[in-house]
């Protein structure tokens, strides 16, 4: 009854209240989730369902691929990395049920919340892995076929994947499990030991470097391959361009919310009304960026289905053609088919 | 008012066990937790855990698991505090000290005057 | 476990003066409701420790208005305005925030 795993009474209604009715007698009973967090667990559910259906598909679907295919590559290590967060979600969901008590010891608390950010750094550097591909196919096709292969981007893909890790990593020491004394909760969070600079320091290189930074550089690489594909009046290219600008948004809409109340939380004082009220949005914030690990499958769908037309087509083999299409590169005159042609810009996962 | 009445002095052998009691009056035993506290000689204060008479649910601080053992008597308002396993180590004057569940106050506010707990052969 | 400490550990005062005692918490004491559990007792000999301030600021009810209390976070004060002699005693700071509950090691307020 007293190590981090009991289940504690629940005085989750004495938060935030400083005059109490000496009178009423103490309720240990469950009482209502607020209303964010109510959201966050249907996000949550809603987002595990279609999130490890959905990559566990594509993965399937692109595994068979991969050893020819790079497009396949690329798409198999979007998915893993979604389909990794996705695994995170029921013991994220247990907590908000329980008020966020965390009752899952200080391991799980460092690695679980952790990898929706490993998923965010992922995502973003693969994304930009893929979006180097897709210019240098447009503006380098002599290079690429003499040097674009399946082993280069394997080795992409693992620095990509390596750097995510690094820049995870303060958020995975910073992580550590507090009990309160009351209302009684065991918690898991970030501490910063009331090192406000630390805080804000870790705050800022999120921001820029999960965010900011490749809002900047996709906004002009995608820039200069949309004007290359129009000028080459690539036959596809207005429904290329919606592709491009749903997959690359979907990312930068999703962890909106996150980045931005992370930012403004690392400058205030954590007793304000402006933290606390942040605070309770925290959750909502989380679940509204996990979404990013579930759309991409419906991205693929939507896109195979509308360029494609192939509704009647079964799901694996609609998957298969948006995600394994090979890029055709011809001589002087490049003209990509796979890449900003088809689906296969959905290089931003996360 | 609010009281807390401990027992008196005890006098014990190493390796043997005591049984402390703290009688509470003056407000309502069930809305709160009764916590204890142990104080040496230059040691300070080192809480022990606490007990909610209501159900009997305890915590007890790391340190203090396996020596203490906290119980709780609804019907006289009387919590108790089991040592087990004496030594020199424990001898100490050992309070209870309530924290009241409805209170605007939300600190351990109002203490026992004090159990003496000497373990000598 | 959040560990407290006490500066100084003896503070001889002279009567009418005012005295200030320091409290720093290893730990962050902000609770996840945004409130801060650090509280003050004074224990004179032979006696069990008395509620002073709560809190941080908030005086218990009997207490008086020369005793007040302030910080945030980690870095706490007390401050008595002007010492009385029944004021004498030993200082804690305490912290209800997380389990385990701890104590500061206590500052002795004594008479020049």
């Known amino acids: 009854m007293d190590s981090f795993n009991y289940t504690t009474p629940d005085y989750g209604h004495y938060d935030d209240k400083d005059t109490l009715d000496l009178n009423t007698p103490v309720d240990k009973t469950s009482n209502t989730l607020r209303v964010p967090d109510i959201l966050a667990l249907v996000i949550f559910a809603v987002v595990f369902l279609v999130g490890v259906l959905g990559n566990a598909l594509v993965v399937w679907v692109t595994a068979f691929e991969a050893k020819r295919t790079i497009n396949a590559i690329w798409f198999l290590n979007l998915a893993v990395a979604d389909f990794l967060s996705c695994l995170a979600l029921p013991i994220l969901f247990t907590s908000i049920v329980q008020h966020h008590h965390w009752p899952f010891g200080g391991a799980a608390c460092s690695i679980l919340p952790s990898l929706i950010l490993l998923n965010m750094y992922a995502s973003i550097l693969l994304l930009a892995t893929i979006s180097a591909d897709r210019f240098l196919l447009v503006f380098k096709p002599i290079w690429c076929q003499n040097f674009r292969g399946a082993g280069l981007a394997w080795i992409a893909c693992a620095v990509a994947w390596g750097l995510a890790l690094l820049l995870t990593i303060p958020s995975f020491l910073y992580r550590v499990v507090r009990e309160e004394y009351f209302p009684p909760k065991v918690l898991c969070g970030v501490d910063y030991s009331h090192d406000k600079r630390r805080e804000r320091a870790v705050a800022i290189v999120r921001l820029v470097l999960g965010f900011l930074w490749p809002l900047l550089t996709l906004t002009i690489c995608y820039t200069f391959i949309l004007l290359r594909t129009w000028s080459r009046r690539a036959t596809r290219s207005t429904k290329t361009l919606k592709v491009v600008v749903a997959v690359v948004a979907s990312f930068f809409i999703f962890w909106l919310p996150y980045q931005v109340t992370g930012i403004m939380m690392s400058f205030l004082e954590p007793s304000s009304p402006t933290f606390l009220l942040l605070k309770k949005l925290d959750s909502l914030c989380v679940s509204f960026a996990y979404i990013n690990c579930c759309i991409n499958p419906i991205i693929y769908v939507v896109a195979g289905q509308g360029f494609q037309g192939r509704l009647r087509k079964s799901l694996p083999s609609l998957l298969r053609n948006v995600l394994t299409e090979e890029s055709v590169v011809r001589e002087s005159k490049s003209f990509t088919r796979s890449t900003v042609d088809t689906m296969a810009q959905k290089t931003q996962a996360v | 008012q609010v009281q807390l009445q401990q027992s008196g002095p005890e006098l014990v052998k190493p390796g043997a066990s005591v049984k402390i009691s703290c009688k509470a009056s003056?407000?309502?035993?069930?809305?709160?937790?009764m916590n204890w506290v142990k104080q040496r000689p230059g040691k300070g204060l080192e809480w022990i855990g606490r007990i909610y008479p209501g159900d009997g649910d305890t915590k007890y601080n790391g340190k203090f698991k396996g020596k203490a053992t906290l119980t709780a008597d609804k019907s006289s308002s009387t919590a108790y505090m089991q040592l087990s396993s004496l030594t020199s180590e424990d001898s100490a004057v050992y309070f209870c000290a309530r924290f009241l569940l409805i209170s605007t106050v939300t600190a351990v506010d109002y203490w026992g005057q004090g159990t003496t707990l000497t373990v000598s052969s | 476990d959040v560990v407290m400490t006490q500066s100084p550990l003896s503070l001889p005062v002279s009567l009418g003066n005012q005295a200030s005692i320091s409290c720093r918490s290893s730990?962050?004491?902000?609770?996840?409701?945004?409130?801060?559990?650090l509280h003050w007792y004074l224990q004179k000999p032979g006696q069990s420790p008395k509620l002073l301030i709560y809190?941080?600021?908030n005086r218990f009810s009997g207490v008086p208005d020369r005793f007040s209390g302030s910080g945030s976070g980690t870095d706490f004060s007390l401050k008595i305005s002007r010492v009385e002699a029944e004021d004498l005693g030993v200082y804690f700071c305490s912290q209800s925030t997380l389990v385990p509950l701890t104590f500061g090691a206590g500052t002795k307020l004594e008479l020049k």
């Open positions: 809190k941080v600021s």
């Open positions: 003056g407000y309502a035993f069930s809305n709160s937790w």
């Open positions: 730990q962050s004491l902000v609770h996840s409701n945004g409130n801060t559990y």
